[in-house]
């Protein structure tokens, strides 16, 4: 009675191919003839699952990364059976929205490239979608702008698919720099102030980063001594009657408003006196 | 890829003008700002200006008097023209893409009689 | 103008020691900022644009933090490549405005 170890062993993937990530995947070791019988069985990677019984493996909510898997057959000795790739097909991975350029901040005007970038996808034929506050801008793995404008600031999302699923990027902020612009005078409590109130003119503008420093002029074009955004004239004089403007600046560069008009006039008590 | 290089003339007297241009290639200055840094020998950077992509200009208020920055899309180049030199003005000057992204080699400046 | 108050002015040190440098603006400055590494005789490059964000292809051990007006750069395990001055600028108010610098030596 000659004894020998398990001969031919073989690992059987049991499910339909192909196998998907989540799915259940039932593995068999198979022995063509053992003496003594077999015992037991093992799996590597070892202590991955619980023991299987009867040479079956279930492998529950199988990973995108159980690449191979190998089982031998034991008797007095243990016959390895060469490995199975589970070849797991998953949907892609890590996606995420990368800037090419420019390097750091991105200014009015300048010409920017976005790229989609994920780790990994099985299998491998993938395709890209861009979209910006649920509308698609673009299929390409990159997104590019010419000449980017304040206007295309905001959310944009990056998805890649394949024939297993489709996997999104984090919503990535576009931010855009630019000079003052969109500026205003802006007068309370109205464009037309009784003498010996008060008027407060606002410069009002749009700019990232916000602005810094506020110059007002008058109807001559002479700067008038205020930085502030708001301009108070208390008690208010008819000589203050005239147009206005502002402009501000921030890091990026000016703007300017166009001319506003403040009439002042005479009080009652003036007219009465006259 | 993104390269910058200044050309200037090295040694000017004071009171002359001084003239640098940075050519710029690898993306086009339709798009892109152009700022101008200087370093004085073993001193720190210091922000003298910034040319857009629309041609705007920002200059730093210590030097809007003697400062102007122009360029020539078509050539790619960015100038640079610092009036009434004082020894002071001695440094590298380097040009830059927006605030820094690319740099040029510099060029160093001597301002002496 | 912005004074940007960089300190050290200078320092030394060890291969694998985790270093900050550090910069305060004179008023607020919204995470507007940059960091610049500068090595002798060459020019400056950037590492990091609004106060935290790492520009491609630096190294992962260099971090930035900050806002308001007091932001830090660090570098996590220093490495003899990252010998020379490290300069910050705010760019949230005009005109824009460097630190004077930190020169990193090695001990």
């Known amino acids: 009675d000659v004894q020998y170890p398990p001969k031919k062993v073989t690992t059987v993937i049991q499910n339909p191919m192909p196998i998907r990530e989540g799915d259940t995947v039932t593995l068999s070791c198979n022995y063509n003839s053992s003496n003594p019988s077999v015992t037991r069985y093992e799996w590597k990677p070892h202590g991955a699952w619980e023991e299987p019984s009867l040479g079956v493996l279930k492998i529950q909510n199988v990973g995108w990364d159980n690449t191979t898997i190998a089982c031998a057959a034991c008797n007095s000795w243990c016959s390895w059976a060469s490995p199975v790739a589970l070849n797991v097909q998953y949907a892609p991975r890590d996606v995420r929205v990368r800037k090419i350029k420019p390097l750091s901040e991105i200014h009015s005007g300048n010409s920017v490239s976005l790229q989609c970038d994920f780790s990994s996808s099985h299998p491998k034929e993938v395709q890209f979608f861009w979209e910006k506050n649920g509308r698609l801008l673009g299929k390409e793995s990159q997104l590019n702008f010419d000449s980017i404008s304040p206007e295309d600031a905001g959310s944009y999302s990056c998805w890649v698919n394949n024939s297993i699923g489709q996997t999104a990027s984090k919503a990535w902020t576009l931010e855009v720099l630019y000079a003052p612009r969109r500026l205003r005078v802006s007068m309370s409590p109205g464009d037309q102030v009784m003498e010996g109130k008060s008027a407060t003119l606002t410069c009002e503008s749009d700019a990232n980063p916000p602005v810094s420093h506020y110059t007002w002029f008058d109807w001559n074009n002479q700067s008038l001594p205020y930085h502030s955004q708001k301009l108070r004239l208390e008690p208010v004089k008819v000589q203050h009657s005239g147009a206005y403007w502002c402009q501000g600046t921030n890091s990026v560069g000016k703007g300017r408003s166009p001319l506003s008009t403040l009439t002042v006039y005479y009080s009652p008590e003036t007219i009465g006196r006259r | 890829q993104v390269q910058l290089k200044e050309s200037g003339p090295g040694l000017v007297a004071p009171s002359q003008s001084l003239s640098i241009t940075c050519t710029v290639s690898g993306l086009s200055l339709n798009n892109y700002g152009v700022s101008w840094v200087r370093q004085p020998p073993g001193k720190g950077l210091e922000w003298l200006g910034v040319?857009?992509?629309?041609?705007?200009?920002n200059y730093h208020s210590a030097l809007i008097s003697r400062l102007s920055i122009s360029k020539d899309n078509s050539k790619s180049q960015v100038f640079l023209k610092l009036n009434s030199l004082h020894t002071d003005d001695t440094a590298t000057y380097y040009c830059?893409?927006?605030?820094?992204?690319?740099w040029g080699q510099g060029t160093t400046l001597i301002v002496s009689s | 103008d912005i004074k940007m108050t960089q300190s050290p002015s200078s320092m030394n040190a060890s291969l694998g020691e985790r270093v900050t440098i550090t910069c305060k603006a004179s008023?607020?400055?919204?995470?507007?900022l940059s960091w610049f590494q500068q090595k002798p005789g060459k020019s400056p490059k950037i590492l990091i644009y609004?106060?935290?964000r790492l520009i491609d292809g630096v190294p992962s051990r260099f971090s930035g933090s900050g806002s308001g007006q007091d932001y830090s750069l660090t570098i996590s395990s220093l490495e003899y490549e990252d010998m020379g001055i490290y300069y910050c600028?705010?760019?949230?108010?005009?005109?824009?405005?460097f630190g004077a610098g930190t020169k990193l030596e090695l001990k």
């Open positions: 600028l705010q760019y949230g108010v005009f005109p824009l405005t």
């Open positions: 008023q607020d400055i919204n995470s507007y």
């Open positions: 040319i857009w992509g629309d041609g705007s200009t």
């Open positions: 830059a893409i927006n605030w820094g992204d690319y």
């Open positions: 609004r106060a935290n």
